[in-house]
């Protein structure tokens, strides 16, 4: 019962986490900047992974996708990649975990198979959560680094003076959503891995086969495989452990006339 609860809770927590990662990836508020308070209008700029938006005090908002910009920072591309990998792994993990849930019966699926699937999905959730946390942290680091580099820099360019506006960079809502979502996905993954231990059978039942030699004078058979399969020198009763998988040579269960002198 506790295993089912742990697995179910892990699934729900991961589901919420992955939904959060998707939401964070799509959000525009990764970084927010109080840009400029000039005599015309106050301007508020916020940027996401896919587009940049500017909002004026009048309420007018304009957003533009980054595809219009050449040479996007490598860090931004890395963050995009991490978030997408996180979403893809999380989505696959969710699919796998649905079939792994103990409360859902699919055909004659054994507990060992469900345990393996639970472990697989758990690992996927953990990696997904780590990807999201890493992505958000890389972006946050990029913001902090940019802030320290954006001291009012003035230079004269072709056709006038260009001044870097010193803006106050703040972490956008998407960063916090991403951190929390990544954490939830990670926790969900750990819970799935814990549930896996409870799902796995505690001991494997092996088929025991006892072989008896029919005579006292048993000839030594050099180099034969049968020395390891209960024949030849094995005159005493021994349990031979096999996992049910045998080669064609091992199918023979009883001594043949060729085994004896």
């Amino acid at each position: 019962m506790a295993v089912t609860a742990c697995q179910g809770l892990g699934f729900v927590v991961s589901l919420i986490g992955i939904a959060g990662i998707i939401a964070a990836t799509c959000m525009d508020q990764w970084s927010t900047q109080d840009l400029y308070n000039n005599p015309v209008t106050a301007v508020f700029n916020y940027q996401g992974l896919w587009r940049s938006c500017v909002r004026e005090s009048s309420g007018f908002t304009e957003c533009r996708g980054y595809f219009t910009l050449l040479g996007l920072p490598a860090m931004l591309q890395a963050v995009r990649a991490l978030m997408i990998v996180g979403i893809v792994l999380g989505a696959i993990g969710l699919l796998v975990s649905i079939f792994a849930l103990k409360c859902i019966r699919i055909g004659s699926m054994e507990d060992s198979a469900k345990a393996n699937m639970t472990l697989t999905s758990g690992i996927m959730f953990i990696v997904s959560g780590l990807c999201a946390i890493a992505g958000v942290s890389v972006f946050a680091n990029m913001l902090v680094t940019n802030f320290w580099m954006s001291t009012a820099n003035m230079y004269t360019g072709m056709g006038g003076m260009v001044q870097t506006v010193q803006t106050r960079y703040t972490f956008g809502a998407a960063l916090f959503v991403g951190w929390v979502a990544g954490g939830l996905t990670l926790i969900g993954g750990v819970m799935m891995c814990i549930a896996c231990r409870g799902l796995a059978p505690e001991e494997t039942n092996y088929k025991a086969v006892s072989y008896h030699a029919s005579g006292h004078s048993v000839a030594y058979k050099p180099g034969g495989f049968k020395a390891s399969t209960g024949f030849g020198s094995n005159t005493k009763n021994k349990k031979i452990y096999d996992g049910g998988a045998r080669t064609e040579d091992e199918v023979q269960s009883y001594p043949s006339k060729h085994d004896y002198v």
């Epitope: 970084s31 000039n38 209008t41 304009e62 910009l69 920072p73 803006t167």
Partner: nanobody, 120 residues
């Protein structure tokens, strides 16, 4: 790198008209605000008129009703239509734009200035 090219300045008689233009080019993502400032001989810099991307405008009291600011967002170009010019409008007119050129890259760019002389 962002460049501004101003044009349209010159000598005009009182009561006459001029049209200034300012074209922005380079790595431009958003231009939230564009404006015209002027500096008369021996005086400080003052805002003449400004316009936001959304169409909000602001004019200096001394030019209200005489000057009209407009912008072409597609061409990233700013215009200032100056009518009923007076001798006190004589100044160097500077184009000023706020440019978002990328993530965390916000620039305030000033033009090289164009001289407007109102004299009979």
């Amino acid at each position: 790198q962002v460049q501004l090219v101003e044009s349209g300045g010159g000598l005009v008689q009182p009561g006459g008209s001029l049209r200034l233009s300012c074209a922005a080019s380079g790595s431009i993502f958003h231009i939230p605000v564009m404006g015209w400032y002027r500096q008369a001989p021996g005086k400080g810099l003052e805002l003449v008129a400004g316009i936001s991307r959304g169409g909000t405008t602001n004019y200096a009291d001394s030019v209200k009703g005489r000057f009209t600011i407009s912008r072409d967002n597609a061409k990233n170009t700013l215009y200032l239509q100056m009518n009923s010019l007076r001798a006190e409008d004589t100044a160097v007119y500077y184009c000023n734009v706020l440019v978002v050129s990328g993530i965390g890259s916000t620039l305030e760019v000033w033009g090289q200035g164009t001289l407007v002389t109102v004299s009979s």
